[in-house]
């Protein structure tokens, strides 16, 4: 092909020419190319008009191309380029007009390019620039040059892993002249040991990230004091998993935050084994979102009921026991992948609407009632990937629930009463792989609004699917895969007029019957793959609903013998519906094993006697 040795990803649009030992820009790529990856080629030098042949380019990746010199107008003609990646090039000579002509550039990545200063970086004319990533360089001064006043669209400035030690008032002068209140600034992994008080006074930022910046707690405290006067939508403090400098926090560690205006706060990778953390977070009582990620914490009981947090996130933290959470204003709680407390204890969250308690290995002595959560406003509840959950209440006071996920938790007492009877607003229910054995036809009674039901990996009494879906008149998606099913009631799906997707894969059906699907006028996808289907169980196979677009019968045990000729012919007649038809193979007889069913030509004659 003309573009070889490059790889054509999307014809005329996207080409990957990675690591092909090119010394110059290839000339066999179409003019119309929009995305071009030239990374890991020894280009070394970019002269003027290097990319004249690609006027439509939007994304250009020149990572690790050993580029040392970029001449004036190297990218001239790339007026549509929005992303330029120069990561890992040992640039020594960068002409003043190196980036001229890039009138649409939005993202410039110059990570690890030997950049020693922003002052001499010739990007002041890139008015469309939204994201500038100059991480992993040799920048020592945080002074934002005057030309930043031209970069009125700048939203992300990544200065992480540089050599910045001191931040002075004059460094941010340009932000006073031309406020960039949407700017997110990442200063992580700079060895900061001094921030001049007032440097951030009256400055507004969207996000400020300071992770693994401080050698010890005292430096951190004084630097936080130096942030006084900053108004920031989101502040991220802490460390990285592999970059830990700070010992245990003390209760005054975050005192300086009282002098900032913060909307959202996140703390990462720290140890807070304090007996009383209320003092630690007192200055954050009024933030709307509070997040602890990978923080070892002794007691969360000390969060005050009066804290005005609306969103609390506790992820991958370590607790001595499940925290007693009592917060008046909280609307969203994300408590996931935590270690420690293995038994849920009730929380008092009267404003709560969204609750994610997934992946904690928690056991629930009872579930679920408004008294467990202290709210009647809950709409979203995720209890997936936990331990034993005993269903002892039918969601009294939780009638507003719309989304409920139990997947991969161990549900007990599911077949003793209509657990979901009061959930008339529920739209999404996942009870996949919950050790549920359906032995009670009223299991889904009351779910009048349900659209999605996932119940894969469970089991049914006598491996028979009874009429358990009678209330689910709004169901559009049903997953019954891996349920060891062998038979189903002919009327099992009769009320599911809106059903569009039905997954019956990975069960133990030996025959296919179209009859149960006659009342599914909206059915589009039917998956019967990974069963043991040999034939149909009635002579007269009717047609599937006309709405059906995809029928998956792959990986079954088709019997390619004369007695099943009409069934095999029927399959051929459904050819336009079949998904991955080439994977539909004969299982018997042995001489036809592995042969594609659709290529069979079975001619059978009646023996005349």
């Amino acid at each position: 092909e003309s573009w070889e040795p490059c790889v054509e990803v999307v014809p005329n649009i996207t080409y990957q020419c990675m690591e092909l030992k090119f010394y110059k820009i290839p000339d066999n790529i179409p003019f119309s190319t929009k995305n071009l990856d030239l990374s890991f080629n020894p280009l070394r030098h970019l002269g003027s008009y290097s990319f004249l042949r690609f006027p439509e380019l939007q994304v250009l990746d020149l990572s690790r191309c050993e580029i040392q010199t970029i001449e004036d107008g190297a990218y001239q003609s790339l007026s549509h380029l929005s992303t330029l990646i120069l990561t890992g090039n040992p640039i020594q000579s960068l002409a003043l007009g190196a980036f001229s002509g890039l009138s649409s550039l939005q993202k410039l990545v110059a990570v690890e390019t030997n950049l020693a200063s922003l002052e001499n970086f010739p990007i002041g004319h890139l008015k469309t620039l939204k994201e500038l990533n100059v991480a992993h360089n040799l920048i020592q001064s945080f002074k934002l040059p005057e030309y930043f006043s031209n970069l009125t669209n700048l939203e992300h400035l990544d200065l992480s892993s540089n050599k910045i030690q001191n931040i002075y008032c004059k460094d941010l002068q340009v932000l006073h002249q031309m406020p960039l209140s949407n700017l997110s600034l990442d200063l992580s992994l700079n060895p900061i040991n001094f921030i001049q008080p007032g440097a951030f006074k009256e400055i507004r930022l969207h996000k400020l990230t300071l992770r693994s910046n401080f050698d010890d707690l005292n430096v951190m405290k004084t630097c936080i004091q130096g942030l006084a006067g900053l108004e920031v939508h989101r502040l991220v403090l802490g460390e990285f998993r592999n970059e830990r400098n700070l010992e245990e926090f003390d209760k005054s560690s975050l005192e300086g935050l009282c002098n900032l205006t913060i909307e959202e706060f996140r703390l990462t990778y720290l140890d807070c084994y304090l007996d009383n953390i209320i003092d630690l977070f007192n200055c954050l009582a009024n933030v709307s979102s509070f997040s602890l990620v990978s923080v070892n914490i002794k007691r969360v009981e000390d969060f005050s009921y009066n804290f005005r947090w609306q969103h609390l996130e506790l992820v991958n933290c370590k607790f001595e026991q499940f925290p007693t959470l009592e917060l008046k204003s909280l609307k969203r709680l994300t408590f996931t992948a935590n270690k420690g407390g293995n038994a849920f204890s009730e929380v008092d969250l009267p404003s709560l609407e969204f609750l994610d308690l997934s992946r904690n290995g928690l056991s629930f002595k009872g579930c679920c009632s408004q008294s467990d959560f202290g709210t009647t406003s809950l709409k979203y509840l995720d209890l997936s990937f936990n331990d034993v959950i005993t269903m002892s209440s039918n969601f009294l006071g939780l009638e507003q629930l719309e989304h409920l996920d139990f997947q991969h938790s161990n549900l007990k007492q599911m077949s003793q009463f209509s657990v979901f009877l009061s959930l008339r607003n529920l739209i999404y229910l996942d009870i996949s792989h919950t050790h549920t054995r359906v032995a009670f036809n009223g299991i889904f009674d009351g779910l009048l609004s349900l659209k999605v039901l996932k119940m894969a990996g469970n089991s049914f009494q006598e491996n028979f699917l009874p009429d358990i879906f009678t209330d689910l008149k709004n169901l559009t998606f049903l997953d019954l895969s891996q349920c060891q099913l062998e038979q189903l009631s002919p009327t099992a799906f009769d009320t599911l007029n809106k059903l569009q997707v039905l997954n019956m894969s990975h069960n133990n059906f030996f025959s296919l019957d179209t009859f149960p699907y006659k009342c599914l006028p909206s059915l589009q996808v039917l998956d019967y793959s990974l069963n043991h289907i040999m034939t149909s169980n009635n002579q007269e196979l009717q047609h599937f609903p006309s709405s059906l677009a995809f029928l998956n019968l792959t990986q079954n045990d088709f019997a390619c013998t004369c007695e099943h000729q009409s069934f095999l012919q029927w399959i051929k007649d459904q050819r336009q519906l079949l998904v991955e038809a080439e994977r539909m193979e004969c299982a018997t007889p042995s001489d036809k094993q592995g042969m594609p069913v659709l290529s069979l030509n079975i001619t059978c004659q009646m023996n005349k006697t």
């Epitope: 209320i278 009981e301 000390d302 008092d348 408004q370 002892s392």
Partner: antibody, heavy 118, light 107 residues
Framework: QVQLQESGPGLVKPSDTLSLTCAVS?????????WHWIRQPPGKGLEWMGY???????DFNPSLKTRITISRDTSKNQFSLKLSSVTAVDTAVYYC???????????WGQGTLVTVSS | EIVLTQSPDFQSVTPKEKVTITCRAS??????LHWYQQKPDQSPKLLIK???HAISGVPSRFSGSGSGTDFTLTINSLEAEDAATYYC?????????FGGGTKVEIK
């Protein structure tokens, strides 16, 4: 409106078992909350004894753990307290109460006095 | 267990006077402290939850404050019907415990 009503003998002999029942109206005890026993010796303060959760789980004050049992009958919507090997110090007004999601008690029974005496 | 110490044990007050009752916890309990009023031969009645949140129906003269280990219940202008014993209760951890009570008498 939730209402709780204690009942049981007012006099129990030392070393016997004290038995009380709390009848609840206005909320099914098997559908939510935890249901507690609290006592108050004459002229003294309140002591939390233990509870039964709507799921049937129970927990007790460590000081009473060896002597106390709390059970329930959801069909009658009532829960019961048994305190074995009683002595004179167990003489008190016994209250049943419902705890809210926070650890406080908005609903109490009117209390019943149990005297331990021979 | 967390011990709650109330003071004073007894207070004799003139109507319209301001009453202040304190409750001290043996360890920090954030604001997980609740106040009850108990009149003779009646069961306790919840007045204040979480140190400062008045329960609906409770007269506005009752207020609470404090956090950590020191808490206060204030009755701004005492009325005759306020003669009762007042108890604090911590909800920070089990076993739940009550203070010893403060008896308020009308002079």
């Amino acid at each position: 409106q939730v209402q709780l009503q204690e009942s049981g003998p007012g006099l129990v002999k030392p070393s016997d078992t004290l038995s009380l029942t709390c009848a609840v109206s206005g909320f099914p005890i098997g559908q939510g909350y935890s249901w507690h026993w609290i006592r108050q010796p004459p002229g003294k303060g309140l002591e939390w004894m233990g509870y039964i959760h709507y799921s049937g789980y129970t927990d007790f004050n460590p000081s009473l753990k060896t002597r106390i049992t709390i059970s329930r009958d959801t069909s009658k919507n009532q829960f019961s307290l048994k305190l074995s090997s009683v002595t004179a110090v167990d003489t008190a007004v016994y209250y049943c109460a419902r705890k809210d999601s926070g650890n406080y008690f908005p609903y109490w029974g009117q209390g019943t006095l149990v005297t331990v005496s021979s | 267990e967390i011990v709650l110490t109330q003071s004073p044990d007894f207070q004799s007050v003139t109507p319209k006077e301001k009453v202040t009752i304190t409750c001290r916890a043996s360890q920090s309990i954030s604001d997980h402290l609740h106040w009850y009023q108990q009149k003779p031969d009646q069961s306790p009645k919840l007045l204040i939850k979480y140190a400062s949140h008045a329960i609906s129906g409770v007269p506005s003269r009752f207020s609470g404050s404090g956090s950590g280990t020191d808490f206060t219940l204030t009755i701004n202008s005492l009325e005759a019907e306020d003669a009762a014993t007042y108890y604090c209760q911590q909800g920070h951890s089990f076993p739940l415990t009550f203070g010893g009570g403060t008896k308020v008498e009308i002079k």
